[in-house]
C-alpha cells in the first residue's frame, strides 16, 4: 500500500526565518518626471522607463556600477550626471557615510579631479540642472556643475560640536527622522539649512570593544531628559552667487524664542518663500511661520501674521511628529493634519488662520498621510475603511468641487489580499503606484492618476507565492475586545492546526509605545510567525491605550504617565485571551524591544501572576536615561515642580522586588546608541540587590537592532530557548 | 606587458611649439586616465596634465594652463601633449604616466621619458 | 593646493639598515598618497599606494605608513638596488597633483 498523500506542507524552521528565505519585494519607481521612472534591476542595471512610449532602456548598466562597487545612484535633473553612492559606513538610524563617484551620461565616463572628498555625510543634486550640495566633516559645500571646484559655504563644522546640514543624534532619532537637514529651493537658487549647535549637551559615551588591545571610546553629545539641548539655527544661502552674501538666517517666532525651543521642519512653498516649523520644548505648542524673501534687504522676513500656531489642550501637539503642511498651487493656502474638535486627526484648509481652518476630513478614524496636491485632487491615506484602525486605504478627494468629493482609490482592489497601503506619486501625480503590504501577498501596481486605472502590476511576489505553497502558515485574525468603555484591537496569531478545544501557550508581544500601531493588517513570516508554525504557539499583539490613529482621548490617556496604561492593558487583553477557553494559563509569556521592552519589563513584574516568563531586548528602564525629546514630549520634565515623581515611579528598578515569581530574559546590545546599556545595567543592578535571579545575555559591539547576521542568529536562537524551556516544549 | 613610449621632444626656442604622443601597448588604453609629468634637471617630479579615459575631463598645472592641451586618440591607443609658447622653465624630461586604477590618480606605470629643451 | 614636505632631504646609511622617510602634507590628504622610487636617469618606479598598500611586485623590506598629514616610508633593510631618491605624491585633493620634494638616500 502506498502511504496517502495527505498534507505534505512543512512548518517554518527557525532557519527560515533567520535566512530571510520568505522575504518579499516592492517596488517604488524613482520618478523622474510625470510619466518617467528609474528603477534598478535585479541584475544591478539601472533601467529608464516611460509609462506613455512604453519605451526602456539602460540608462546605467551594472558593469560601470560594480567598477566602483556602487549599491545606490541618483540622477540630476539635467540628466546629464548620476552619482553612484559606495563604502557605506552606517552610522546611526539613518545617517551613514559614503564615497561618491559622479558619472557623465554625455560623455560616458566618471568626471574627474575637484572629486569629491571621502567619506562625504550628505550629497544631493538640486531640483534643477545639476548642482550638487554635500556635506563633509560637518561643513556644506557647494559645485555648481559636477567638474568645478567646490564652494565651502560654512566653516563652523566641528566633530561632535557644530553640525551644519546635517543633524545631530537626538534630531536625527527624535525629530527629522532624516539623514539631513539641507533642503533646496524648487528652482535650485536657494540652499537652506539647520545649524545645529552641540557644545554644551552631555556626553554618552560608551566602549566599542573591536579587536584591539584596548576599546575604544564612543562619545555622542546626546541630552537625556531634562538635560541641555541644542541650540538649532536655520540660515538660507543663495547658491548662485554664495561668495557675494553669506548665509542669511531666518529669525525664530517670537512666542517660540522666549524658552527653549526645537526646529522641526522645513518645507519650500516656492522659489522665494519658505515655511519653518518650530516647536516649544514643551511639547504642547507648535508654530508654523511663512517667510519670504526680501531682495531690497537681501534677508527672509517672517511677518507675525503668517505665523500658525497649533497647540495641544490634552497632550502633545501631533501625532508622532507635528504633521507637514501640504501647499496649493496659490503658494499661501496649504492643507495639514491636525486634532478636530473631538479629538480625531483630520486633514484641514488654512487660508489664512489656523482658527478659520476648513475641515476636509471629519469621522471617528484618522487621515494619517497627505501624499500630494495638485489642482484638482488632494491624495491622503487613512484607517476610515470598516473601522479597523489597522488598515491603510488611499483616497482622492476632488477639491475643484464644491463640496468636495471623495474616492477611496484602493479599498475595493484587491480587498482580502491588500488592506494595507502606500503610494509614490509621479510629480503632478499624472501616474502613481501603489505598494500593498498585505494582509497577503505584499504587490506593487502602476496607476494612471486621472482614472485610478491599473495599468501594470510591477512586483507580484510570485517566486514568494510558490516558495510558501508547501508551508504551513499560522492563521491570523484582527479582531477588537472591550473591557468597560475601551476597545482593544488585538491581532492573534494562530497555530496551523489550531483547535479550540484545546490549550495553547500564549506569547505576548509588545511594542506599546506612544503613537505606536502593532495591530496592523500586513504581511509578516518572521520570528513569531515561526512560534506559531512550527512551535505550537498563540501569539498576541494588543494596541492599548498611548498607540495610535484611533483618536487623542485614546492617545494621548498616556501622557506624563508613561508605563501605567500601557501596561494595564496589556494585563486586561491576557485576562480577557484566558476566558476565550484556549490559552493554557501556566504557559503565558511577554516579549518586547525598547519600548517594548520597559512594557514587557513592567508587566512581568505588575504582580498579578499572569505571566510565567518573559524577555526584555534593549529596553528603556528610566526615562531619565532616554533622549530628551522623546521623554519631555510625553513626560514633561524631570523637575521637582513639574513631572520628577512620575519619573521616579515609572522605572523598571522600582519594581524590582517584582520579578521574583517570573523567569526573565534581559538582553542588551553594548554599543547601543539609542537606549544605551546603561538601561539594562541599572535593572541588573536592581535586580542583585533584591537578590532576584534572573537570566542576562548582552551583544557586544551591537547596537540597538542588533542586527550583525551572526548576533541576530544568536538572539533569536537563544530567545526560543528560553521560551521553549519556559512552556516545557519538547528541543 | 605594459609600455609606454614617448616620443616628439627636441630643441625649440621660447615661443615656439611641440607636439608630444605617447604610445601605449600591453592594455585597454580607452580605460585608464593618463597624465604627463615632467622633471626638471636635478630637480623634482611636477604633474603637468591630466586627461580621463574619455577625453572629457582635462586638468593642467596653473603654469601651463592656456598654453598645453592634452589629448588622447583611443583608437590608435597615443596620448599627445600639444605645448605651445613655449619658455625656458618648460624645459624637462616629460614623462607620461598611466593611472593604476579609476578614482586614484596614482601611477603604475611611467615611460622612459622625452627631453624637451627651450632655449634661446 | 596641497604641499607636500618630505625629510630628510638626504640620508646616508649602509646596506642592512633600517631607513625611515617622512613626508608631511599641509592639510589632510586622508591616505591618498603614494610613494616612488627613482634610480637616476630612470623613469619613477610606484612602490606605495593608500599609504600602506605595496604594489606589485615591490618586496615586503618596504612598508608604508601614516594617515591625514603624517606619513612614512620604511625600508626594513637596505640592499645595494635601495639607494635611489624617494618622491611621495598626493591624490586626495586635485588638480593639481602634488610631489614631495624627494628623499635621496645615499650609501655611507
Known amino acids: 500500500l502506498r502511504p496517502s498523500r495527505g498534507n505534505t506542507k512543512r512548518a517554518l524552521t527557525l532557519k527560515d526565518i533567520l535566512n530571510g528565505t520568505f522575504s518579499y519585494k516592492t517596488y517604488f519607481p524613482n520618478w523622474i518626471s510625470e510619466q518617467e521612472y528609474l528603477h534598478q534591476s535585479e541584475d544591478d542595471n539601472i533601467v529608464f522607463y516611460n509609462i506613455e512610449t512604453r519605451e526602456s532602456y539602460i540608462i546605467l548598466s551594472n558593469s560601470t556600477m560594480k567598477s566602483v562597487n556602487a549599491t545606490d545612484y541618483g540622477l540630476s535633473p539635467d540628466r546629464q550626471f548620476v552619482y553612484l553612492e559606495s563604502d557605506y559606513s552606517k552610522l546611526w538610524r539613518y545617517s551613514y557615510t559614503a564615497t561618491y563617484y559622479i558619472y557623465d551620461l554625455q560623455n560616458g565616463e566618471f568626471v574627474r579631479g575637484y572629486e569629491l572628498p571621502r567619506p562625504i555625510q550628505y550629497l544631493c543634486w538640486s531640483p534643477v540642472g545639476s548642482k550638487l550640495a554635500y556635506v563633509y566633516q560637518n561643513n556644506i559645500y557647494l559645485k555648481q556643475r559636477p567638474g568645478d571646484p567646490p564652494f565651502q559655504i560654512t566653516y563652523t563644522g566641528r566633530e561632535n560640536r557644530i553640525f551644519n546640514g546635517i543633524p545631530d543624534w537626538v534630531y536625527e532619532e527624535e525629530m527629522l527622522a532624516t539623514k539631513y537637514a539641507l533642503w533646496w529651493s524648487p528652482d535650485g537658487k536657494f540652499l537652506a539649512y539647520v545649524e545645529f549647535n552641540d557644545s554644551d549637551i552631555p556626553i554618552i559615551a560608551y566602549s566599542y570593544y573591536g579587536d584591539g588591545q584596548y576599546p575604544r571610546t564612543i562619545n555622542i553629545p546626546y541630552p537625556k531628559a531634562g538635560a541641555k539641548n541644542p541650540v538649532v539655527r536655520v540660515f538660507i544661502v543663495d547658491t548662485t552667487y554664495p561668495h557675494h552674501v553669506g548665509p542669511m538666517e531666518v529669525p525664530v517666532p517670537e512666542m517660540i524664542a522666549s524658552s527653549d525651543y526645537y526646529f522641526s521642519w522645513l518645507t519650500w512653498v516656492s522659489s522665494e518663500r519658505v515655511c519653518l516649523q518650530w516647536l516649544k520644548r514643551v511639547q504642547n505648542v507648535s508654530v508654523l511661520s511663512i517667510c519670504d524673501f526680501r531682495e531690497d534687504w537681501h534677508a527672509w522676513e517672517c511677518p507675525k501674521n503668517q505665523e500658525h500656531v497649533e497647540e495641544s489642550r490634552t497632550g502633545w501637539a501631533g501625532g508622532f511628529f507635528v504633521s507637514t503642511p501640504a501647499f496649493s498651487q496659490d503658494a499661501t493656502s496649504y492643507y495639514k493634519i491636525f486634532s478636530d474638535k473631538d479629538g480625531y486627526k483630520h486633514i484641514h484648509y488654512i487660508k489664512d488662520t489656523v482658527e478659520n481652518a476648513i475641515q476636509i476630513t471629519s469621522g471617528k478614524w484618522e487621515a494619517i498621510y497627505i501624499f500630494r496636491v495638485t489642482q484638482d485632487s488632494l491624495f491622503y491615506s487613512s484607517n476610515e475603511f470598516e473601522g479597523y484602525p489597522g488598515r491603510r486605504n488611499i483616497y482622492r478627494i476632488s477639491i475643484g468641487n464644491s463640496p468636495p468629493s471623495k474616492k477611496c482609490v484602493t479599498c475595493h482592489l484587491r480587498k482580502e489580499r491588500c488592506q494595507y497601503y502606500t503610494a509614490s506619486f509621479s510629480y503632478k501625480a499624472k501616474y502613481y503606484a501603489l505598494v500593498c503590504y498585505g494582509p497577503g501577498l505584499p504587490i506593487s501596481t502602476l496607476h494612471d492618476g486621472r482614472t485610478d486605472q491599473e495599468i501594470q502590476v510591477l512586483e507580484e511576489n510570485k517566486e514568494l507565492e510558490n516558495s510558501l505553497r508547501n508551508i504551513q502558515l499560522p492563521k491570523v485574525e484582527i479582531k477588537k475586545l472591550k473591557d468597560g468603555g475601551l476597545t482593544f484591537w488585538y491581532k492573534m496569531i494562530l497555530p496551523p492546526q489550531f483547535d479550540r478545544s484545546k490549550k495553547y501557550p500564549l506569547l505576548i508581544q509588545v511594542y506599546g509605545g506612544p503613537c505606536s500601531q502593532s495591530v496592523k493588517s500586513v504581511f509578516a513570516v518572521n520570528w513569531i510567525t515561526y512560534l506559531a508554525s512550527k512551535e505550537g504557539i498563540v501569539i498576541a499583539l494588543v494596541d492599548g491605550r498611548g498607540t495610535a490613529f484611533q483618536g487623542d482621548k485614546f492617545l494621548h490617556a498616556v501622557y506624563r504617565k508613561l508605563g501605567v496604561y500601557e501596561v494595564e492593558d496589556q494585563l486586561t487583553a491576557v485576562r480577557k485571551f484566558i476566558e476565550m477557553g484556549f490559552i493554557d494559563e501556566e504557559r503565558i509569556a511577554i516579549w518586547g524591544w525598547s519600548y517594548g521592552g520597559y512594557v514587557s519589563s513592567l508587566a512581568l513584574a505588575s504582580g498579578t501572576g499572569l505571566f510565567k516568563c518573559g524577555i526584555a531586548v534593549a529596553p528603556v528602564s528610566s526615562w531619565e536615561y532616554y533622549a530628551s525629546i522623546y521623554s519631555e514630549r510625553f513626560m514633561g520634565l524631570p523637575t521637582k515642580d513639574d513631572n520628577l515623581e512620575h519619573y521616579k515611579n515609572s522605572t523598571v528598578m522600582a519594581r524590582a522586588e517584582y520579578f521574583r515569581n517570573v523567569d526573565y530574559l534581559l538582553i542588551h546590545g553594548t554599543a547601543d546608541d539609542n537606549v544605551h546599556f546603561q538601561n539594562s545595567a541599572q535593572i541588573a543592578k536592581a535586580l542583585v540587590n533584591a537578590q532576584v535571579d534572573f537570566q542576562a545575555m548582552w551583544y557586544s559591539d551591537q547596537n540597538h537592532g542588533i542586527s550583525s547576521g551572526r548576533s541576530q542568529n544568536h538572539l533569536y536562537t537563544h530567545m526560543t530557548h528560553f521560551l521553549k524551556q519556559c512552556f516545557s516544549l519538547s528541543d | 606587458d605594459v609600455q609606454l613610449v614617448e616620443s616628439g621632444g627636441g630643441v625649440v626656442r621660447p615661443g615656439e611649439s611641440l607636439r608630444l604622443s605617447c604610445a601605449a601597448s600591453g592594455f585597454t588604453f580607452s580605460s585608464y586616465a593618463m597624465s604627463w609629468v615632467r622633471q626638471t634637471p636635478g630637480e623634482g617630479l611636477e604633474w603637468v596634465s591630466f586627461?580621463?579615459?574619455?577625453?572629457?575631463?582635462?586638468h593642467y598645472t596653473d603654469s601651463v594652463k592656456g598654453r598645453f592641451t592634452i589629448s588622447r586618440d583611443n583608437s590608435k591607443n597615443t596620448l599627445y601633449l600639444q605645448m605651445n609658447s613655449l619658455r625656458a622653465e618648460d624645459t624637462a624630461v616629460y614623462y607620461c604616466?598611466?593611472?593604476?586604477?579609476?578614482?586614484?590618480?596614482?601611477?603604475?606605470?611611467w615611460g622612459l621619458g622625452t627631453l624637451v629643451t627651450v632655449s634661446s | 593646493e596641497i604641499v607636500l614636505t618630505q625629510s630628510p632631504a638626504t640620508l646616508n646609511l649602509s646596506p642592512g639598515d633600517r631607513a625611515t622617510l617622512t613626508c608631511r602634507a599641509s592639510q589632510t590628504v586622508g591616505s591618498k598618497l603614494a610613494w616612488y622610487q627613482q634610480t637616476s636617469g630612470q623613469a619613477p618606479r610606484l612602490l606605495i599606494y593608500?599609504?600602506?598598500s605595496r604594489a606589485t611586485g615591490i618586496p615586503d623590506r618596504f612598508s608604508g605608513s601614516g594617515s591625514g598629514t603624517e606619513f612614512t616610508l620604511t625600508i626594513s633593510s637596505l640592499e645595494p638596488e635601495d639607494f635611489a631618491v624617494y618622491v611621495c605624491q598626493q591624490y586626495y585633493d586635485w588638480p593639481p597633483l602634488t610631489f614631495g620634494g624627494g628623499t635621496k638616500v645615499e650609501i655611507k
Open positions: 586627461i580621463s579615459s574619455g577625453g572629457a575631463y582635462t
Open positions: 593608500d599609504a600602506s
Open positions: 604616466a598611466k593611472e593604476k586604477e579609476i578614482w586614484n590618480a596614482f601611477f603604475d606605470y
